[in-house]
């Protein structure tokens, strides 16, 4: 495929990545699918620099990121290593709380109102952020 050298319309460029910020809410899986259909992924936060950038744009609103533990261990959707990577959990989080009465625990991570992270029920309709890297090959086949 061809390389993406600039961000799509309505996406924001920052440090060689493009970001799209939703204004509505979706369940985590639906948000994840939305980003994939845009040839992107839910945002993967790898540094304080990126945390500050995303936090700035989402404001004090619960917002999904590309981190989940639906299959056991915590995993970033792009394969970034969780154990050695950047983390910004709220105190005593993640706690996989079962007391919400919605069945199961809490398997999806989101930004809270102060930017720090919490795990929550994946079905909650939160806003989300998509990310795609500049200079990566797009998935579209080349024109013949």
């Amino acid at each position: 495929g061809s390389e993406r050298t600039c961000c799509p319309v309505n996406w924001v460029e920052h440090e060689r990545s493009c970001y799209w910020f939703s204004r509505s809410g979706k369940a985590w899986a639906d948000a994840d699918n939305y980003c994939r259909l845009e040839d992107a992924h839910l945002v993967v936060v790898t540094s304080w620099e990126e945390q500050k950038f995303v936090q700035h744009h989402i404001g004090p609103v619960n917002t999904w990121m590309g981190l989940h533990d639906q299959n056991g261990p915590w995993k970033w959707v792009d394969g970034t290593d969780y154990e050695t990577g950047f983390k910004n959990w709220r105190p005593e989080q993640p706690d996989d709380w079962y007391g919400h009465g919605l069945g199961g625990g809490e398997d999806c991570a989101h930004f809270t109102d102060d930017g720090r992270w919490n795990d929550d029920v994946c079905q909650r309709p939160y806003r989300w952020v998509c990310e795609t890297e500049l200079d990566k090959a797009s998935q579209e086949p080349p024109l013949l």
């Epitope: 309505n10 620099e49 500050k52 936090q55 004090p60 930017g115």
Partner: antibody, heavy 119, light 106 residues
Framework: QITLKESGPTLVKPTQTLTLTCTFS??????????VGWIRQPPGKALEWLAL???????RYSPSLKSRLTITRDTSKNQVVLTMTNMDPVDTATYYC???????????WGQGTLVTVSS | SYELTQPPSVSVSPGQTASITCSGD??????ACWYQQKPGQSPVLVIY???KRPSGIPERYSGSNTGNTATLTISGTQAMDEADYYC?????????FGGGTKLTVL
């Protein structure tokens, strides 16, 4: 070349509503990450941020003034409008509009317009 | 609401290094930027994203932001640097300005 210019009344009576217009050129308020903000500065005092509107129509307000402020945009006219209700003499200040993109801070400013609140 | 605190004034001799501080709770977790304002003029952005310089700003202007303090450093200070300096941070997507620091070049 990015330019911004504020316009509006120079004198407002107490309790009246102030309407200021920021007319800009050199950028589009439809471009991802772009925003236009309003900042004021009373004579001899510090800068105070008032409001900000982004490319996606996301609006942000100073918590202490939120109930009095409304920010809107007209992308076809390249204008951003700030309204401030219930004006008081302590609101006398130079009002600036400024451009921002992503998290750069306010990188281009208008010349400012002095608004005096007096009966 | 979030507050940023700056010293009201800082004095420096020509050619020396001036440091202006800006303090706020967990400021290092937010973006900080700095503005220079001379009498009768609009503010000018001199540092953004903690440490980046816009084009046209001399290299002697630098910034840092860690813990609870952001610092603007002007090395080899010149008479033309005499001005008011304001820090600004983004808190929960709203902007906050410090009270300003008057830099005097003796």
């Amino acid at each position: 070349q990015i330019t911004l210019k504020e316009s509006g009344p120079t004198l407002v009576k107490p309790t009246q509503t102030l309407t200021l217009t920021c007319t800009f050129s050199g950028f589009s308020l439809s471009t991802g990450g772009v925003g236009v903000g309003w900042i004021r500065q009373p004579p001899g005092k510090a800068l105070e941020w008032l409001a900000l509107i982004y490319w996606n129509d996301d609006k942000r307000y100073s918590p202490s003034l939120k109930s009095r402020l409304t920010i809107t945009r007209d992308t076809s006219k390249n204008q951003v409008v700030l309204t401030m209700t219930n004006m008081d003499p302590v609101d006398t200040a130079t009002y600036y509009c400024a451009h921002t993109i992503a998290v750069r801070g306010f990188d281009y400013w208008g010349q400012g317009t002095l608004v005096t609140v007096s009966s | 609401s979030y507050e940023l605190t700056q010293p009201p004034s800082v004095s420096v001799s020509p050619g020396q290094t001036a440091s202006i501080t800006c303090s706020g709770d967990k400021l290092g977790e937010k973006y900080a930027c700095w503005y220079q304002q001379k009498p009768g003029q609009s503010p000018v952005l001199v540092i953004y994203q903690d440490r980046k310089r816009p084009s046209g700003i001399p290299e002697r202007y630098s910034g840092s932001n860690t813990g609870n303090t952001a610092t603007l450093t002007i090395s080899g200070t010149q008479a033309m640097d005499e001005a008011d300096y304001y820090c600004q941070a983004w808190d929960s997507s709203t902007a906050v300005f410090g009270g300003g620091t008057k830099l005097t070049v003796l």
